[in-house]
């Protein structure tokens, strides 16, 4: 399964779009979860509206917002006020009963605001990339190739 690498600036918003087959996933709720380890569980952050027909309505948990365009087959997750602690590996999921199908794996990287002199601590700033672009990363390509996914405010 592809891994999408997305970079966002601390304090700004990062929008993640996961596309899927609208017919195959008809009637299924979507979720955004954080993968906590190699084989560990994917911890649910937020999921779409309990009533599938209302999935277009924005659902929020803290600073994370999810909304699903079920006709277009696109679920959009917005991470607002991005913080260093938001960096990590996430999944877009399609829910079917108790089972969850992974639609996309998303690696979120948080870039430190160069004007902020505070200690970055656990913040990881990739040396080879100064732009805020993300890249569609197949298991055969590296960062900063292919399609760009600029973060939005």
């Amino acid at each position: 399964l592809n891994t999408t690498v997305l970079q966002g600036m601390a304090g700004q918003s990062l929008r993640v779009s996961c596309t899927y087959d609208a017919l195959k996933h008809w009637g299924r709720r979507k979720a955004w979860c954080r993968q906590l380890g190699e084989e560990g569980p994917c911890q649910r952050v937020v999921s779409t509206h309990g009533v599938w027909l209302l999935a277009f309505l924005k659902k929020r948990n803290g600073s994370t917002v999810i909304a699903d365009d079920t006709l277009a087959g696109t679920v959009t997750i917005t991470l607002k006020n991005l913080q260093a602690g938001d960096a990590g590996l996430y999944q877009c999921q399609s829910l079917r009963g108790r089972e969850a199908e992974v639609l996309q794996k998303v690696l979120v990287e948080v870039l430190e605001d160069p004007l902020d002199d505070q200690d970055a601590g656990d913040l990881w700033v990739p040396e080879e990339s100064s732009s805020f672009e993300g890249a569609q990363v197949e298991h055969s390509t590296s960062r900063n190739q292919e399609t760009s996914f600029p973060p939005t405010s």
Epitope: E38, D122, W124
Partner: antibody, heavy 122, light 105 residues
Framework: EVQLVESGGGLVQPKGSLKLSCAAS????????MNWVRQAPGKGLEWIAR??????????YYADSVKDRFTCSRDDSENMFYLQLSSLKTEDTAMYYC?????????????WGTGTTVTVSS | NVLTQSPALMSASPGEKVTMTCSAS?????MYWYQQKPRSSPKPWIY???ILASGVPARFSGSGSGTSYSLTISSMEAEDAATYYC?????????FGGGTKLVIK
């Protein structure tokens, strides 16, 4: 800066004991799993021990080659990670590396120390 | 879970494409790669199968799934001469491959 610094290596006789230390800085140490990896002279890398974070009950894991002889522990208040080596054998002679991997937000990003040398010889 | 790297030793000329493989005896979620040069500690090189670690040149790439993984250098440079190790963090014991030593022709 994220950093791991090992210490405590040295020359020890067979059947002897030694305690290695790893000082961590620049990251939220208490949220990460920590590991020891060693490399015998001219040989490849061998993972030997792991301790998980408090939220994972400080679970420990060992390679068969060191089980019941080596013990790893941690002190989250001091950002320290340890490896107690006992009943040492000549084949334990190696460079010992402290490695961060697992449990934290960036569980997939490894951080390695520069290593400390252990020589087991009579 | 045994990781087998091949070849154990390989040489390449500057500009040449290089591919080394890592085969796992049972399926793993991700593969990790490290670069090590003489008298230096290993450097994380590729994580989560295909993501380049900070500072790694874009000529490197990683790929694979299940039991078969590879590291590729699109155009060999002198500074790439080193030993490369693969590792799986999926299952205890967290095994390493035996390494592929890459030398410059």
């Amino acid at each position: 800066e994220v950093q791991l610094v090992e210490s405590g290596g040295g020359l020890v006789q067979p059947k002897g004991s030694l305690k290695l230390s790893c000082a961590a800085s620049g990251f939220s140490f208490n949220t990460y799993a920590m590991n020891w990896v060693r490399q015998a002279p001219g040989k490849g890398l061998e993972w030997i021990a792991r301790i998980r974070s408090k939220s994972n009950n400080y679970a420990t894991y060992y390679a068969d080659s060191v089980k019941d002889r080596f013990t790893c522990s941690r002190d989250d208040s001091e950002n320290m990670f340890y490896l107690q080596l006992s009943s040492l054998k000549t084949e334990d002679t190696a460079m010992y590396y402290c490695v961060r991997h697992g449990d934290g937000n960036l569980w997939y990003i490894d951080v390695w120390g520069t290593g400390t040398t252990v020589t087991v010889s009579s | 879970n045994v990781l087998t790297q091949s070849p154990a030793l390989m040489s390449a000329s500057p500009g040449e494409k290089v591919t080394m493989t890592c085969s796992a005896s049972s399926s793993v979620s991700y593969m990790y790669w490290y670069q090590q040069k003489p008298r230096s500690s290993p450097k994380p090189w590729i994580y989560l199968t295909s993501i380049l670690a900070s500072g790694v040149p874009a000529r490197f790439s990683g790929s694979g799934s299940g039991t078969s993984y590879s590291l590729t250098i699109s155009s060999m440079e002198a500074e790439d001469a080193a030993t490369y190790y693969c590792q799986q963090w999926s299952f205890n014991p967290y095994t390493f491959g035996g390494g592929t030593k890459l030398v410059i022709k």
